[in-house]
């Protein structure tokens, strides 16, 4: 809190503003008749330094010419950027209690002059915007500097605006107010910046530009898209621009595409036809906008406009399998399936899918319509039938995919040779095969056809499966393919009117199971024993069991235990066993084993043959 | 409505300074550029100087450095800090309020709306 100055003063010099590096004197003088009462000779005036409201130093040692009792010179050298305060304190030596008093204060501002301000820049945000320039100052003053913006044009009419820097707010930019319309867009404007403070002054170099320079058009607005008779692949943008504009450039995409399709137009005048659109699909639309061919800037993107095309009649063709069960001998019952089109064939909302089955020779037709992929008859077991089924959405159906029903698996002359599954990684399995060795007729396709060997799969879940050519011998399946689960995989074998099949077991991924079967019932039967057992439950077999294996040895044995290894069959739940000796107790167990190993063993049970035994 | 009045002319010799002054009434008059326009006799109206609402400037390239034009919005008041007089500048100045937008329309007295009577400015030799 300095003093209204009523002691004395204090003087600068050079001035209160100096350059970095350079020393000033500070001068502190009292006023006549002010000082310590009764010994003016023992007045001693002292200068203390400030920065941030800190005391720093007491500048006593720094006198460089002193008249007692009534002024003092000190000399400051080593100032830092920004603003440092002193103060000028009377002490009066005689009373060693009183505090100095103050008299009077100075602040000294250090700085530098200012570089002349770079790379101009100046935009007008459409025709109706206003030209605002931005430009770099360079090194910061740590003064206050004003900055003059100049604009002169034709006319002979000069437009300028000033802002400051300080340590509080920086100025480099600044907004004329002041529009640059069409008329002068063949004008050539010259812009310059003018930095000034009490150190010096710098000017820019002169920065030429155009009306087509500088003027960035608004982004075009109002975007619609009109689809001509309701095409879904033909459509015509429509938008509003600002009247200069000669150059557009329409970016669109589909929603989940990661692309955009580019179209530059020229005089569009707001209209532009696009003919590639896919129909049904969502698409997203921007333009920009240049006011002139070969300078000036490109609008911002325009707001998207996020429309879908309408529908097409669906195009392509169904993925159809079929499977066959004799109900009794003169019925059976057919099962039809096949996969939705994918989006670029459905091409809108399928609504149903038209089945047919037909018997070829007497012309019976059954003929039905279903929003489902799968459609299941029961027929008779006689006759030549075929299938086909189309897909409807509003604007019409595919063209229907037909398929001969046969006896999938009833030609063993057309069943694959050598047919192995193997493991490819957590969620697929690679199968492969050999061709039919004797085959009557060519084989027009394979079929590759896997379902989860758990219960009740065959009527719950549709089957899987993939069409192969028939020169190639493998399928990659990955669809609905999971880890630790069992599948029956099998590679029918078709021609025009016959089918072969040859079948195997196989998983993605294996662990030993988690246990043993458990054993219901082991009973004698003419000199042999059956054991029975119920199955592992399907979440714990952890893959495809190879085989079974059934463990015995005498009760209260320390002796290995002697096994009999049984291959897998999923119908097998009972196996004879007959080297055991009569009236001798038992203990009998099962594990049962994957590719991964051998579980643990399941419940024992004891059991004490009666009969003879071999 | 906004009326106009100015303030200030009078008999200078070349090299001297005057200070015009116009005095606006009315409560919008910050919605307003402001302008002066001098006509010297036998000549068409000629715009020497004016200052948006956002107090950019803009003169004519013969006062460019001699002329100031500033704004005081509280007291409603524009002027014209004219030094370094020349016989040529000799003319009758008037106050302008208008709302020109573009580059184009700062010098086009058909621009402005409202005018002051003039005053009368005489640079001797």
């Known amino acids: 809190n300095i003093d209204v100055c009523k002691l004395g003063t204090v003087t600068v010099q050079p001035a209160p503003v100096i350059p970095l590096g350079s020393a000033a004197n500070i001068s502190c003088s009292l006023n006549p008749k002010q000082g310590c009462s009764h010994y003016p000779s023992s007045n001693e005036l002292i200068l203390l330094k400030f920065v941030n409201d800190v005391l720093v130093e007491n500048l006593h040692g720094k006198k460089v010419h002193d008249h007692t009792g009534h002024s003092s010179t000190f000399q400051v050298t080593n100032l830092s950027l920004g603003m440092t305060l002193f103060v000028c304190k009377l002490n009066c030596s005689n009373s060693q209690k009183k505090p100095p008093v103050p008299v009077c204060g100075v602040e000294i501002s250090v700085g530098v002059a200012p570089e002349p301000p770079q790379n101009i820049s100046c935009v007008q945000e459409g025709e109706n915007g206003t030209v605002a320039c931005s430009w770099n100052s360079g090194k910061v003053t740590y003064l206050k500097t004003n900055y003059t913006l100049q604009l002169s044009g034709p006319n002979n009419l000069t437009c300028q605006k000033q802002c400051f820097s300080d340590n509080r707010q920086n100025c480099n930019r600044l907004d004329l107010g002041i529009n640059l319309s069409p008329d002068l867009a063949e004008s050539r404007f010259i812009v310059r910046v003018t930095a000034i403070n009490d150190l010096g002054n710098s000017s820019s170099l002169p920065h030429t530009f155009t009306f087509l320079d500088i003027v960035i058009p608004l982004p075009p607005w109002d975007i619609r898209i009109n689809f001509l008779n309701a095409s879904g692949s033909r459509g015509t943008l429509q938008w509003e621009d600002e009247g200069q504009v000669v150059l557009n450039q329409l970016r669109y995409q589909p929603l989940n595409s990661t692309s955009w399709n580019m179209v530059n137009a020229t005089n569009a005048k707001g209209k532009y036809d696009l003919r590639d659109l896919r129909p049904f699909t969502e698409y997203e639309f921007q333009i920009s906008s240049k006011l002139h061919l070969s300078g000036g800037s490109w609008s911002n993107w325009s707001e998207s406009l996020r429309t879908r095309t309408p529908e097409e009649e669906p195009v392509g063709i169904l993925d159809i399998w079929y499977m066959k069960q004799d109900i009794d001998y003169d019925r059976q019952q057919i099962s039809l399936f096949w996969k939705s089109l994918n989006p670029s064939e459905a091409r809108g909302k399928i609504l149903h899918y038209q089945v047919t089955l037909q018997e070829v020779t007497k012309k019976t037709t059954l003929q039905n319509t279903t929003r489902h992929t799968s459609w299941t008859r029961v027929i008779p077991r006689t006759g030549a039938w075929t299938a086909s089924v189309s897909a409807a959405n509003s604007k019409g159906a595919s063209a229907p995919t037909h398929i001969n029903i046969v006896d999938l698996c009833g030609t063993g002359l057309l069943a694959p040779h050598q047919v192995s599954a193997k493991s490819e990684n957590m969620d697929n399995i690679l199968v492969t095969w050999q061709p039919p060795k004797k085959a009557d007729s060519a084989v027009r396709e394979y079929i590759v056809e896997w379902r989860a060997l758990q219960p009740g799969s065959i009527t719950k879940f549709p089957p899987h499966w993939l069409r192969i050519p028939p020169d190639n011998m493998s399928a990659l399946i990955s669809e609905n393919i999971k880890p630790y689960i069992c599948y029956e995989i099998r590679v029918h074998a078709l021609s025009e009117s016959q089918g072969g099949c040859s079948s195997i077991r196989g998983d993605s991924k294996h662990k030993a199971p988690v246990s043993g079967p458990h054993i219901t019932a082991i009973t004698e039967k003419k000199e042999r024993l059956f054991i029975s057992w119920t199955h592992i439950p399907f979440p714990e077999q952890r893959g495809c069991i190879l085989h079974y294996r059934i463990y015995w040895k005498e009760r209260d044995s320390t002796a290995q235990p002697e096994l009999c290894e049984i291959q897998y069959r999923r119908s097998q739940n009972s196996h004879p066993i007959s080297s055991l000796q009569p009236r001798v107790t038992y203990v009998l167990w099962m594990t049962a084993v994957t590719a991964a190993g051998e579980s643990p063993q399941g419940n024992e049970r004891e059991f004490c043959p009666q009969g003879k035994a071999n | 409505q906004v009326q106009l009045q100015e303030s200030g002319g009078g008999l200078v010799q070349a090299g001297g300074s005057l200070r015009l002054s116009c005095a606006a009434s009315?409560?919008?008059?910050?919605?307003?550029?402001m302008a002066w326009f001098r006509q010297a006799p036998g000549k068409e109206r000629e715009f020497i100087a004016a200052?948006?609402?956002?107090?950019?400037?803009l003169y004519i390239d013969s006062v460019k450095g001699r002329f100031t034009i500033s704004r005081d919005n509280a007291k409603n008041t524009v002027a014209l800090q004219m030094n370094s007089l020349k016989p040529e500048d000799t003319a009758v100045y008037y106050c302008a309020a208008g709302m020109p937008y573009s580059y184009s329309d700062y010098p086009r007295d058909s621009k402005y709306d409202y005018w002051g009577r003039g005053t009368q400015v005489t640079v001797s030799s």
């Open positions: 200052i948006t609402r956002s107090d950019t400037t």
């Open positions: 009315g409560r919008t008059f910050n919605n307003y550029a």
